[in-house]
């Protein structure tokens, strides 16, 4: 989304990032649009303190992350090198476990109740993380 | 032991409403998404209802949105269903049972049900 | 929403037969896909969950496998006590279905 100078109302400010936690439940597809219309994008994990901010706020419940493969390789939402990155998979994962019939695996990556995270078909009704960047130019001294 | 009780079943008009309780022991109820089953006579079952174990997420069938409304008192370890409006084809046993996570993993324990009548 | 087709509706069976109910899904639902019994007069009893898992206290001879939109449920060797209408259910997504059930008699 386009980058602001001040967090929304609701949403809470982590270095120069905006988060919106849900309380309710979507499939990953829904909860990306909802994120979309706020101007913001499904939560991109950058590095092992975001990932804590992140897990201390969710809890012990599986919620969506903006990372998903239904296209084929794994990609971040924001266009973040996935490759590169930073990752937290559970020991196993992730599986892109195929039996389920819905064409491909399972597409959509979440965290799970540990906050290592898991692939799961993307139908699934978990809550959900948005995130948006603030105004880098305002965090700058101005130019003289 | 895990226990689940329903309650406040009865016969009612058709237009009118009634309030299900179910009683939970034998765990903790707040870490458990809770959800409401029914079976008309004779048929099989329908899902009616869930909540998740904080009350955050509420879902509903089509056949109930609208006029029934799914609670939780953690505190009182109880499930309620509020039901108004009420129909012919509501004529039901009302379970509640429990979630085995949240409120998205299936249903593991069962209560013993409540009988609902809606008859003119 | 998600329909679930069982078959057979009903079945006879004789004690010490091996039975398998079958569960088709209107799509795909991961394996979130659950087993219960039903005795007249009695509530549910869940059996089986994420399509082959047994559920605490549910003896073995219960058996539950498949993938995509085909589901089994096998009793390996029908005793007296088995004697009951069983459902399928999917929890992949809300709201949740359930199949219309077996019903499995005594030949």
């Known amino acids: 989304g386009s980058e602001r100078a001040c967090c929304p109302v609701n949403w809470v400010e982590h270095e120069r990032s905006c988060y919106w936690f849900s309380r309710s439940g979507k499939a990953w597809a829904d909860a990306d649009n909802y994120c979309r219309l706020e101007d913001a994008h499904l939560v991109v994990v950058t590095s092992w303190e975001e990932q804590k901010f992140v897990q201390h706020h969710i809890g012990p419940v599986n919620t969506w992350m903006g990372l998903h493969d239904q296209n084929g390789p794994w990609k971040w939402v924001d266009g973040t090198d996935y490759e590169t990155g930073f990752k937290n998979w559970r020991p196993e994962q992730p599986d892109d476990w195929y039996g389920h019939g819905l064409g491909g695996g399972e597409d959509c990556a979440h965290f799970t109740d540990d906050g290592r995270w898991n692939d799961d078909v993307c139908q699934r009704p978990y809550r959900w993380v948005c995130e948006t960047e603030l105004d880098k130019a305002s965090q700058e001294p101005p130019l003289l | 032991q895990v226990q689940l009780v329903e309650s406040g079943g009865g016969v009612v008009q058709p237009g009118r409403s009634l309030r299900l309780s179910c009683a939970a022991s034998g765990f903790t109820f707040s870490s458990y998404g809770m959800h409401w089953v029914r079976q008309a006579p004779g048929k099989g079952l329908e899902w009616v209802a869930v909540i998740w174990y904080d009350g955050s997420n509420k879902n509903y069938a089509d056949s109930v949105k609208g006029r029934f409304t799914i609670s939780r008192d953690n505190s009182k370890n109880t499930l309620y269903l509020q039901m108004n409006s009420l129909r012919a084809e509501d004529t039901a046993v009302y379970y509640c049972a429990r979630d085995q996570g949240v409120g998205y993993d299936g249903l593991d324990v069962w209560g013993q049900g409540t009988t609902v009548t809606v008859s003119s | 929403d998600i329909q679930m087709t069982q078959s057979p509706s009903s079945l006879s069976a004789s004690v010490g037969d091996r039975v398998t109910i079958t569960c088709r899904t209107s799509q795909g639902i991961g394996k979130y896909l659950a087993w219960f019994q039903q005795k007249p007069g009695k509530a549910p009893k869940s059996l089986l969950y994420?399509?082959?898992s047994l559920q605490s206290g549910v003896p073995s001879k219960f058996s539950g496998s498949g993938s995509g939109t085909d589901f089994t449920l096998t009793i390996s060797s029908l005793q007296p006590e088995d004697f009951a209408t069983y459902y399928c259910q999917q929890y992949m997504t809300y709201p949740l279905t359930f199949g219309g059930g077996t019903k499995v008699e005594i030949k």
């Open positions: 994420k399509v082959s």
